[in-house]
Amino acid sequence: IWELKKDVYVVELDWYPDAPGEMVVLTCDTPEEDGITWTLDQSSEVLGSGKTLTIQVKEFGDAGQYTCHKGGEVLSHSLLLLHKKEDGIWSTDILKDQKEPKNKTFLRCEAKNYSGRFTCWWLTTISTDLTFSVKSSRGSSDPQGVTCGAATLSAERVRGDNKEYEYSVECQEDSACPAAEESLPIEVMVDAVHKLKYENYTSSFFIRDIIKPDPPKNLQLKPLKNSRQVEVSWEYPDTWSTPHSYFSLTFCVQVQGKSKREKKDRVFTDKTSATVICRKNASISVRAQDRYYSSSWSEWASVPCS
Amino acid sequence: RAVPGGSSPAWTQCQQLSQKLCTLAWSAHPLVGHMDLREEGDEETTNDVPHIQCGDGCDPQGLRDNSQFCLQRIHQGLIFYEKLLGSDIFTGEPSLLPDSPVGQLHASLLGLSQLLQPEGHHWETQQIPSLSPSQPWQRLLLRFKILRSLQAFVAVAARVFAHGAATLSP
């Protein structure tokens, strides 16, 4: 058993039918010694008396808010949550496996630049009685600070018969060094509590591996005289790290016909312009990627050829 | 070429070669991004590689003030990786494919380090840890980790030379 926060405790249980459970001793936070009784949740049934209460925690029915009273007055509370360990593996019932980029990916994170700011998100089908708390650091043995905000519900989707809820959180490294080569990964820890079930999820990454620039901005076409060719130009996204002579991007320019089956013409360039042939009913798209490190491409910025 | 005593390197040449290094490092092991090699307990293997750290002056401001600190750090790293790529880790079993970019990568590391440091001038270099994995699969894992680490190192070096070529070239 360990303390998650004040008056909230997590009991770690080997989880299988007929498991012996864990013996837990609760102590009433009071100088009083006599006349103390204990109850669980909203029930008025007295579970025991005395300054301490010893319980055998086996299932969710044994978890909940234990309260000690004296003469009708509440003295203190202890909320017991359960953390299930099935066959040596901690349960992951609360969050959905996003399976990208690999199985057992519950948290996904992205950064728009090298400033040390990043966003993580996760999915669940649970709509109520759900709380998240997020902590982060750079490195684990001698951790350096990363400050995370509160997790918020960022999207709701219908998937078949189920509703899916996306939560996200923004974090910022306290003393980020955008130009340095990271040697210690960022660690992100999410505590999830659903009713009386506790679970924790972690992710470990380098900012460089989660970079995904915003799409190029101000995408424009300039027809070239007496030619089917056009000059496409664009700019670095505002959110990208500066100076651009240091934090450089490379670009992919694509000409795509109306039909998905039509052959795509692609050009790669380090410049912020390119000359391409504009076909009727086609569209021109540009996306960006770090020039020197193969992290994710941005989403496409597009304009119609017409 | 860099000249001892603080004069500038051939920024444009260094830029071109460092960008080529980036391409080679990724073609040598493109899928490494999809393997979580940190799960494989690499503390004792790749923690000793020289990293370009915050105080090494490789940021735009640091380069403007005095690029020599940063260039020395990059040189140190290039020599370190050049030695690793020429070691038993890469030459032993399992053998690299004949068309593997590792050979080119090795040569380019050497080329860039020579651009930064002419003969007769010696910056101090970092000692290579003695890594001699016994099993072929351990060697393979170590190669992946070294290439992964090299990808990060050459990315920073390429940024430095690109910025230098754009803003510090005579």
């Epitope: 969710f60 099935e86 066959d87 | -």
Partner: antibody
Framework: EVQLLESGGGLVQPGGSLRLSCAAS????????MSWVRQAPGKGLEWVSS????????DYADSVKGRFTISRDNSKNTLYLQMNSLRAEDTAVYYC?????????WGQGTLVTVSS | DIQMTQSPGTLSLSPGERATLSCRAS??????LAWYQQKPGQAPRLLIY???NRATGIPARFSGSGSGTDFTLTISSLEPEDFAVYFC?????????FGQGTKLEMK
Amino acid sequence: EVQLLESGGGLVQPGGSLRLSCAASGFTFSNYSMSWVRQAPGKGLEWVSSIRSSGGRTDYADSVKGRFTISRDNSKNTLYLQMNSLRAEDTAVYYCATGIAVARYWGQGTLVTVSS
Amino acid sequence: DIQMTQSPGTLSLSPGERATLSCRASQSVSSYLAWYQQKPGQAPRLLIYGASNRATGIPARFSGSGSGTDFTLTISSLEPEDFAVYFCQQYASPPRTFGQGTKLEMK
């Protein structure tokens, strides 16, 4: 005492369907993950499928993916295995068991024979 | 998929003797390994999980050891009721895979 009782096995033609049930008692069924494991006559054991306590997450062996569906009704304390497009190689004794990884408690099994 | 290989295929011993059964994984499964006993016409019974933890109600003569790729089930002194087929199973990564079994028969 934990008890698991399978039913629904029998003889079925190739391409046919069958639904196996497993009635659980002696424990709080809705709290625990469950699995199906099968054993071809005179052969070894093969994990078939598993389902989490809430029914929200399921896993299948490649050999049955797309043909078998595991489900549960926590109000009835029952685990199910819907088997479609049955093949001769699906002939086996099918056991239901508690757990997703380690099969701690087993039923006595029900025999499924796929033959024309 | 992770392949599990048990040896020997058959082991002939007498009551009172010590039995040593081996199980090898094609790649590391850490300590995520279980052993089961199966008697003719019966469902398997869990003996050991986590490579070395005895399941509820399993006699102390059964012990498991090993980690990574090589595992051993030891029965210190065979009782007549121990003659059965023994299976190992990894649960480090899906799909959970079983060994082909070792038949422990009376000499």
